[in-house]
Interface confidence: medium
């Protein structure tokens, strides 16, 4: 807590400018009007304040806005955002995507901090759903963002937002998350033709049921082994040897290298040896 002291004569700040870096902490507290600071926040980032000075500026804003900062201030916090605690952020009402982008930019290159996680949570809750633009923004900054959400949270993602998802955004998703995302993707891409549809749906197939895999096997899709290995075991087991052969096309030979790994191992054990032999890969059931 900075002690309240009178501002020395001639030092009252009437603008946020570089001269303030020479002010001691108590002078900043005494000589900078919080409302002036709030309305000239965009200038703060251009001034090389010390961490201690930023603490004083934050303290002034906290006093001015005990119920939480308005968005006009939040949008221009810049590096002062790094001084905020999740408790501070929980008081905010962030509705503008521009504000979200500005703050994510400050944290760019770092892992998702508790502050950022809280900010995103406040933003998404405020919007009611993860719309396409938001998802686009979040995955651009944090490719693993989607997979950090619970299945319950993912259920609020509208199918239209799936268009913003890139394959790498799903790299860390587990089967429960893909179970939620796959039906949305199927709905989103339903009007595309066969080959285009497969390119788009491929990343989501870890949530596909058996009947959809059977349908894909009739479309000469040539699924690669990496995708096949991510399929749900319970969805793969009912597939016949002929269906897997059609599904994988020229990639079927890759089954040999994966015969000890799930879901290939479990699928092999379910097949008749005669059927496996037709593949000519030496797979032993």
């Amino acid at each position: 807590e900075v002690e309240k002291t009178a501002c020395p004569s001639g030092k009252k700040a009437r603008e946020i400018d570089e001269s303030l870096i020479f002010y001691k902490k108590w002078e900043l507290e005494a000589c900078v009007d919080a409302a002036l600071l709030a309305t000239q926040m965009d200038r703060v980032n251009a001034i090389p304040f010390t961490y201690e000075q930023l603490d004083v500026l934050k303290h002034k804003l906290d006093e001015l806005y005990p119920q939480g900062y308005p968005e006009s201030v939040i949008q221009h916090l810049g590096y002062l955002f790094l001084k905020m605690s999740p408790e501070d952020i929980r008081k905010w009402n962030v509705t503008s995507l521009e504000t979200l982008k500005a703050l994510l930019e400050v944290n760019k290159g770092h892992e998702m901090s508790p502050q950022v996680a809280t900010l995103i949570d406040r933003f998404v809750k405020g919007r009611g759903q993860l719309d396409k633009d938001t998802l686009d923004t979040l995955t651009a900054f944090y490719p693993g963002y989607l997979c950090s959400l619970s299945p319950e949270e993912l259920s609020s993602v509208p199918p239209s937002s799936i268009w913003a998802v890139r394959p790498q955004d799903l790299d860390t998703c587990d089967p429960r998350q893909l179970d939620v995302l796959y039906p949305k993707a199927r709905l989103a891409f339903q009007n595309m033709n066969g080959s285009e549809y497969f390119v788009k749906i491929q990343s989501f197939l870890g949530g596909a049921p058996t009947e959809d895999l059977k349908a894909l096997s009739q479309q000469n899709v040539s699924m690669d082994l990496a995708t096949f290995m991510k399929l749900r075991t319970d969805a793969v087991l009912p597939l016949t040897v002929a269906e897997v052969q059609k599904l994988l096309g020229p990639h079927v030979e890759g089954l040999k290298a994966e015969e000890r790994h799930r879901p290939v191992r479990d699928w092999i054990l379910r097949q008749r040896q005669d059927d496996l032999d037709t593949l000519g890969l030496g797979l032993q059931g």
């Epitope: 001639g10 030092k11 009437r14 603008e15 400018d17 570089e18 001269s19 303030l20 009007d33 919080a34 409302a35 002036l36 709030a38 309305t39 000239q40 001015l64």
Partner: antibody, heavy 117, light 112 residues
């Protein structure tokens, strides 16, 4: 475009009070001081004081302490100056101006106050 | 309070000729942040004042470049290179460095 629109002329009795308004448009009202200036023929321009609408912070010229009181309403972007216990010395044109740091960059059209019995 | 002394009180100039107004302050107007808050205003007849120059020499937008401000510390000058009819009125210097802000007494520019 920055504009400051002041209330109309006032004819007041000695001892009465008057409240002058200054409505700001075209900029972020809370971000700049509103300055108040008095002009009397033969007396030039005198700075009365200022208010920062965002916080309500005020600064008064010692000469006008007890005479002028500043308020601001950020919901209507309007600043007010009340002058109390009016005498003939208070007859003047009063201007509001936007305080751009240490200079008054935009001025209202002025409000004439005449104190007469 | 800082006293601002303006000279001359009246200036009678022929159109097209130069004009110069002086403003002296009783204290230095250099502020603690390194800036000097000396401004020039023009009040045309029947109008409210309009700022021409701030921070000694910076022209406000829309102000013709025939106006120049100069000076430092306690001595300041406003020059008009070629006076035009629209320049008539009363010119004031005003300081914003020390509270209370104070104005010069004004210089009336008349056209000969």
């Amino acid at each position: 475009e920055v504009q400051l629109q002041q209330s109309g002329a006032e004819l007041m009795r000695p001892g009465a009070s008057v409240k002058i308004s200054c409505k700001a448009t075209g900029y972020t009202f809370s971000a700049y001081w509103i300055e108040w200036v008095k002009q009397r023929p033969g007396h030039g321009l005198e700075w009365i004081g200022e208010i920062l609408p965002g916080s309500g912070s005020t600064k008064y010229n010692e000469k006008f302490k007890g005479k002028a009181t500043f308020t601001a309403d950020t919901s209507s972007n309007t600043a007010y100056m009340q002058l109390s216990s009016l005498t003939s010395e208070d007859s003047a044109v009063y201007y509001c101006a936007r305080g751009d740091y240490y200079a008054m960059d935009y001025w209202g059209q002025g409000t004439s106050v005449t104190v007469s019995s | 309070d800082v006293l601002m002394t303006q000279t001359p009180l009246t200036l009678s100039v022929t159109i097209g000729q130069p004009a110069s107004i002086s403003c002296k302050s009783s204290q230095s107007l250099l502020y603690s942040n390194g800036k000097t808050y000396l401004n020039w205003l023009l009040q045309r007849p029947g109008q409210s004042p309009k700022r021409l120059i701030y921070l000694v020499s910076k022209l406000d937008s829309g102000v013709p470049d025939r106006f120049t401000g100069s000076g430092s510390g306690t001595d300041f000058t406003l020059k008009i290179s070629r006076v035009e009819a629209e320049d008539l009125g009363v010119y004031y210097c005003v300081q914003g460095t020390h509270f209370p802000f104070t104005f010069g007494s004004g210089t009336k520019l008349e056209i000969k």
